[in-house]
Interface confidence: low
Amino acid sequence: EVEKTACPSGKKAREIDESLIFYKKWELEACVDAALLATQMDRVNAIPFTYEQLDVLKHKLDELYPQGYPESVIQHLGYLFLKMSPEDIRKWNVTSLETLKALLEVNKGHEMSPQVATLIDRFVKGRGQLDKDTLDTLTAFYPGYLCSLSPEELSSVPPSSIWAVRPQDLDTCDPRQLDVLYPKARLAFQNMNGSEYFVKIQSFLGGAPTEDLKALSQQNVSMDLATFMKLRTDAVLPLTVAEVQKLLGPHVEGLKAEERHRPVRDWILRQRQDDLDTLGLGLQGGIPNGYLVLDLSMQEALS
C-alpha cells in the first residue's frame, strides 16, 4: 500500500507524459489523478515506466474502478495488462474483438498465461459463442488456446468455425474437450469424400466413438500410431484385432512399441491371446485361452 502524501508544489500532473518517469512512486500516487490516467491510458504504453511505477498506476485505476475497468480503459492497458491478476480480469466485460487483439498483442510470443486464459474466458462468455472471427484471431496468437477452454465453453463453437481449426490447435486438448469438438467436426466435414474427410477429421478422432472407428476401419485409412494413441480408451476397447489391423493398415507393427501405453495396453488386455498371436507381433497379456470373455457393456446395462 502506497502511503498517502500531499503532492509537492508544481508537480501535479496535467497530462500523462514522459516527465512522469522521473517521479518517485509516492509522487505518482500523490500527483497523478486517477480520472486523468483513465482518459489518457493510450499514452501509458508509449512511456518507459518501471514495473514499480506501473504498480502505482494500476493501484490508482483499482481505486477508481473497484467493480472492474470499463472497456475504454481495458483496450489501452498495453503493458499494464501484464500487471493484472486473473481476479482483476474476472471483473471485466470485454466484448470488442479489437480490445481482445490489443491485449493478446501485449502477451505475444509467450505461453498462454492465467491472465490471458481468464481474458479469453470472459470474452467468450460475453459473446455467447465462439464465432469464426474470434477463432481466427485466437488461433493466430495461441495455437493451443482451444484446449484451454472448458467443454461447456467449447459447446458454443458452431460447426462452421471448425474449418478454422488446425491440427496443432488440438495438441493439448484432453478427451473431454475432443468429445465436444468431434461431433462438430463430423458435421462440418460430412460432405467431403473418404480420403479428404479422414485428413480433416484425423485431429479430432480423440473424441470419436467406437462405431465411427469401426466404420473408418472399413475405409483403408491407414491410421498412424500417433493418432491411434490419442483415441479414447473406451472407444478402442471394443474393437476386434481384425478391426484394429484394418484401421492401422501397415502401421499395425507399431503396436509392439506402444504395448505398455494407453490405449494399446488396455486394448491388449481385453483381447484373446489367440487373436493377438495372429498379428505376429509378440503382443502379450491377452485373455488366456479357455477364459470366458464377458461383454462388459452388456454386463453394465444389465446391472
Partner: antibody, heavy 117, light 110 residues
Framework: EVHLVESGGGLAQPGGSLRLSCAAS????????MAWVRQAPGKGLEWVAN????????YYVDSVKGRFTISRDNAKNSLSLQMNSLRAEDTAVYYC??????????WGQGTLVTVSS | QSALTQPPSASGSPGQSVTISCTGT?????????VSWYQQHPGKAPKLIIY???RRPSGVPDRFSGSKSANTASLTVSGLQAVDEADYYC??????????FGGGTKLTVL
C-alpha cells in the same frame, strides 16, 4: 542363469539422498521392462517404479513422484534408482526386478535402505 | 493400507487344499487379466508362481493354480506340503502403468 544384483543401500538421513544400482545378466536386458519394488520391514510388497526398454518412459507410484528417478544404461545392463528427499517411510528392502506385462518374473535379492536420524 | 485385500493368514494340513483370495475393484482385478501371485519364504526374494490369472511359469508345480471371478482373484494350493509354508502376495495391473500388490497372506502348514 538370470542374475539381478542390487547395490547402494545403506543408512541415510531424512531429507538425504541415495542411489541404488542393479547389475543384470542372463537375459536380454535391453528388451525388457525393468522395475523397482520395495518391502518395508515386516510389511508387504509395494511397486515403486518401472521403465521402458529404451528408457523413454518411466512410471512411479504417487508417494515417490518428484523424489525418485528410475534410469537405465542398456550398454552396461544396469538399472538405477536415484532417491532424493528421503523420508522415514522409504525405509525398506528395495528389489530390482524384471517386469513382464505387470508381473515380476525375475527378482534380485534386495538391498536395505534405512532412513533415520 | 494395500490396494488389494488379502486375508492375513490361511492354513491347512499336509495333502489338503487351501485357497487364498485377493479382492480388488473393477478398475484393477475386475478390469484386466493381469493378476499374478508370488511366494516369499522368510529372508528371501519373492518368486513368481502365477501370472496372467492362471498361467504357471516353467518349474512351478501344477499344485498351484489361479483363477478369477469378477473383482476377486484366487490362488489354490492343492496337495499341501511343508515347503509351501510362506507368505503369498497377489498383484494386479491397476491402470496408468501401476502395479498393485495385496497385503500378503501367511500360509501355515499344520
Amino acid at each position: 542363469e538370470v542374475h539381478l544384483v542390487e547395490s547402494g543401500g545403506g543408512l541415510a538421513q531424512p531429507g538425504g539422498s541415495l542411489r541404488l544400482s542393479c547389475a543384470a545378466s542372463g537375459f536380454s536386458f535391453s528388451s525388457s521392462w525393468m522395475a523397482w519394488v520395495r518391502q518395508a520391514p515386516g510389511k508387504g510388497l509395494e511397486w515403486v517404479a518401472n521403465i521402458k526398454q529404451d528408457g523413454s518412459s518411466q512410471y512411479y507410484v504417487d508417494s515417490v513422484k518428484g523424489r525418485f528417478t528410475i534410469s537405465r544404461d542398456n550398454a552396461k545392463n544396469s538399472l538405477s534408482l536415484q532417491m532424493n528427499s528421503l523420508r522415514a517411510e522409504d525405509t525398506a528392502v528395495y528389489y530390482c526386478a524384471r517386469d513382464i506385462w505387470y508381473s515380476i518374473d525375475y527378482w534380485g535379492q534386495g538391498t536395505l535402505v534405512t532412513v533415520s536420524s | 493400507q494395500s490396494a488389494l485385500t488379502q486375508p492375513p493368514s490361511a492354513s491347512g494340513s499336509p495333502g489338503q487344499s487351501v485357497t487364498i483370495s485377493c479382492t480388488g475393484t473393477s478398475s484393477d482385478i475386475g478390469g484386466y487379466n493381469s493378476v499374478s501371485w508370488y511366494q516369499q519364504h522368510p529372508g528371501k526374494a519373492p518368486k513368481l508362481i502365477i501370472y496372467g490369472v492362471s498361467r504357471r511359469p516353467s518349474g512351478v508345480p501344477d499344485r498351484f493354480s489361479g483363477s478369477k471371478s469378477a473383482n476377486t482373484a484366487s490362488l489354490t494350493v492343492s496337495g499341501l506340503q511343508a515347503v509351501d509354508e510362506a507368505d503369498y502376495y497377489c498383484s494386479s495391473y491397476g491402470g496408468s502403468n501401476n502395479l498393485l500388490f495385496g497385503g500378503g497372506t501367511k500360509l501355515t502348514v499344520l
